[in-house]
Structures are given as structure tokens and as C-alpha cells.
């Protein structure tokens, strides 16, 4: 293990609770599902639920566990070592470049155009021009006609785990 | 004293590799988590890798990622990066680093090596 | 990432003027900050972590406090050495820093 996820917020916590498993770091690191103590003598086992770490680390604090906003389904939650999955509903998905909400999927071609790709999590419905086949890209102008889409099947995590 | 001398920076096109060295003394090498820290031109400092004492486990921020390994080699009393596939905004002065006692963070640090990224 | 905000950018004092250095982060990291100064083509120097306890070597007239998410560097009196860029650093999570503030002779 060797990469790192995006940063997720910080979880407060009292990291010498007594219902945290401890054990001894290996070569001045903790694994997966832990952080590091102040001293660093001791791996601090992250909370389920709650928080979690991914990666051999000297974090102070595991990372807080992503809570799946409205509009999104949790595909798999939260456990010590990966955070949670969070998918956006049907009829809608999430881009790349603004990755904080998900966008209602167009459900229609603009005139002249057909559409070659459906609504999935992660992209909107893919319109060709009828003739020469190049992408659409922009804001919809009139809709021709009304396409319903199947969103897709794998999933997309709301941050990175690695 | 502990010393920290970083070697092996230089001018690289884009896409191109590089291997940084840092010879470390004055300590007990083996014992002491190291990192890699970088500074571009005018810019502020940004960590770049993380290692273990014994070189069993590393850690990067998504920014290299993929591109840069860090390893040790304790016999040698040696700490490398290996730099490839890169880019213009890697251009930086890179540092080794030593984690230090009780402490959590970075305690000494090396002069620093320039690497320029530029076609 | 936990974003470190450092201010000033840049200030000038003469010897023996008391400055203050502040750094915000983004969410609360504890006391887990360092302080580091440094020089122009130098390494930089560790002088406080913990947020407020200082590093062996370290002159008395540097001080650290804080905790949470603001922190403040002081050196009670400025002398002709401390001329520097000083860093604050969060290591909570990772390692963030602060983008510098350059002290300059006034």
C-alpha cells in the first residue's frame, strides 16, 4: 500500500478512549485502520462507522467517514480501512469537475442530434450529430425528443480510497 | 551533528526520470521515519513521500502519486526518489527530511536539491 | 486537505520590535503545528512543535500558542538573525504548510 486517498475531514476524537484497540507500530508507522499516538508508541484502531484510515500512516487523527448527501445511495459504508461509497441516484449524475452535487441527466437530444450513450452516475446522456457524428458539449437547446435513460451499473465513490 | 545532503537534482525535460539521493549521518539512519519535501520557485513548502524506518511501507499525496517512489537503503545510510513522467510544476528545490522523536514532524532538514523540469 | 493560512505574507520590523506571526487552519488539528524558519538557499530549522514546545537549540524569545485552528509564532525581540521566511506547518493529517512570512529589516 502505498497511495494516498484524497483528504477527508479530520475525526475528533479522544484517541486514548478506552474501547480503542492499541498496538505497536511497525518501523515508525501504523497500518491500515489506525493512526498514530502523540507519542508515537502506540496504533490507534480508527472507529467503524466513523472514521478510518487506508493507508501504512503517521496520522494523528483517522480520517471522518463521508456521510452520503441527499440525491446519493450509499453502495457500501464506511469500515475502518475504506471510506464510504456513495453513488448518485437514478436519472442523475456527477461530473468531474464539479464533483460536490449531483446534476439532473438531460433527457433529450438537442434537434439533429442522437443519443449514443445513456445516463449513468458519472455522466449525462451522449449526443452525436446525426451526420457527421461529433459530440455534443453545452447546454441543451431544444429538446426533440424525449429519451428515457438507464443509469449505469458500477459505482463511484464519493472520495477515492485508493 | 545530523546531516542531511541531497544529490542528484538537475535539468530534465518533461516526461523524463530522475533519481535524488540524500546521504544521511549523524544518527542512527535505520531508526527514523524519512520524507521528501519540495519548494517551487517563490512558492511555499509541499511533502512529497513518506517511508517507513526499515523501507516496508510508503506513503504520497495524490499529487505524485504514481509518478514518484520513494525507497532507503539503511546500509548505505542512503534515502531516494525516484521522479518519472515529469512535469513542469514538479520544478521545485526537493529536501530529505527526518521525522523526528516523539514529535511527529519533521525535525532536520537537508539544503535542499534544484530540480528543473523545462523543454 | 487541511489548508494552513499564514499572516502576514511579509513584514517589517527593526531589531529588537516584538513580532507575531498567526496561522488559521481549515479545521481544528489539535496542537499537532510546527513552526520552521529559513533562510534564503538554507534548510529549514524546526523551532517549535507541539504547537508551542520548543526545539532543543532554540532561542527563548521564540514562543508558540494555539491549538484548534489558530496559531501564533512570537519573537519577543527581534534580533539581526531572525531575519528569515518562517512556516508554520499543520501534521495532523499529512503535512500542510503555510505559505511563508518573509521578516523583513524595516
Known amino acids: 500500500e502505498s497511495a494516498l486517498i484524497t483528504q477527508q475531514d479530520l475525526a475528533p476524537q479522544q484517541r486514548a478512549a478506552p474501547q480503542q484497540k492499541r498496538s505497536s507500530p511497525s518501523e515508525g508507522l501504523c497500518p491500515p485502520g489506525h493512526h498514530i499516538s502523540e507519542d508515537g508508541r502506540d496504533c490507534i484502531s480508527c472507529k467503524y462507522g466513523q472514521d478510518y484510515s487506508t493507508h501504512w500512516n503517521d496520522l494523528l487523527f483517522c480520517l471522518r467517514c463521508t456521510r452520503c448527501d441527499s440525491g446519493e445511495v450509499e453502495l457500501s459504508p464506511c469500515t475502518t480501512t475504506r471510506n464510504t461509497v456513495c453513488q448518485c441516484e437514478e436519472g442523475t449524475f456527477r461530473e468531474e469537475d464539479s464533483p460536490e452535487m449531483c446534476r439532473k441527466c438531460r433527457t433529450g437530444c438537442p434537434r439533429g442530434m442522437v443519443k449514443v450513450g445513456d445516463c449513468t452516475p458519472w455522466s449525462d446522456i451522449e449526443c452525436v450529430h446525426k451526420e457527421s457524428g461529433t459530440k455534443h458539449s453545452g447546454e441543451v437547446p431544444a429538446v426533440e425528443e424525449t429519451v428515457t435513460s438507464s443509469p449505469g451499473t458500477p459505482a463511484s465513490p464519493c472520495s477515492l480510497s485508493g | 551533528e545530523v546531516q542531511l545532503v541531497e544529490s542528484g537534482g538537475g535539468l530534465v525535460q518533461p516526461g523524463g526520470s530522475l533519481r535524488l539521493s540524500c546521504a544521511a549521518s549523524?544518527?542512527?539512519?535505520?531508526?527514523?521515519?524519512m520524507s521528501w519535501v519540495r519548494q517551487a520557485p517563490g512558492k511555499g513548502l509541499e511533502w512529497v513521500a513518506t517511508?517507513?524506518?526499515?523501507?516496508?511501507?510508503?506513503y504520497y499525496p495524490d499529487s505524485v502519486k504514481g509518478r514518484f517512489t520513494i525507497s532507503r537503503d539503511n546500509a548505505k545510510n542512503t534515502l531516494y526518489l525516484q521522479m518519472n513522467s515529469l512535469r513542469a510544476e514538479d520544478t521545485a528545490v526537493y529536501y530529505c527530511?527526518?521525522?523526528?522523536?516523539?514529535?511527529?514532524?519533521?525535525?532536520?532538514w537537508g539544503q535542499g536539491t534544484l530540480v528543473t523540469v523545462s523543454s | 486537505d487541511i489548508q494552513m493560512t499564514q499572516s502576514p505574507s511579509s513584514l517589517s520590523a527593526s531589531v529588537g520590535d516584538r513580532v507575531t506571526i498567526t496561522c488559521k487552519a481549515s479545521?481544528?488539528?489539535?496542537?499537532?503545528v510546527a513552526w520552521y524558519q529559513q533562510k534564503p538557499g538554507k534548510a529549514p530549522k524546526l523551532l517549535i512543535y507541539?504547537?508551542?514546545t520548543r526545539h532543543t537549540g532554540v532561542p527563548s524569545r521564540f514562543s508558540g500558542s494555539g491549538s484548534g485552528t489558530d496559531f501564533t509564532l512570537t519573537i519577543s525581540s527581534l534580533q539581526p538573525e531572525d531575519f528569515a521566511t518562517y512556516y508554520c506547518?499543520?501534521?495532523?493529517?499529512?503535512?500542510?504548510f503555510g505559505q511563508g512570512t518573509k521578516v523583513e529589516i524595516k
Open positions: 479545521q481544528d488539528v489539535g496542537t499537532a
Open positions: 527530511a527526518r521525522r523526528g522523536d516523539s514529535m511527529i514532524t519533521t525535525d532536520y
Open positions: 507541539w504547537a508551542s
Open positions: 517511508i517507513s524506518s526499515g523501507g516496508s511501507y510508503t
Open positions: 506547518q499543520q501534521y495532523s493529517s499529512y503535512r500542510t
Open positions: 549523524g544518527f542512527t539512519f535505520s531508526s527514523y521515519v
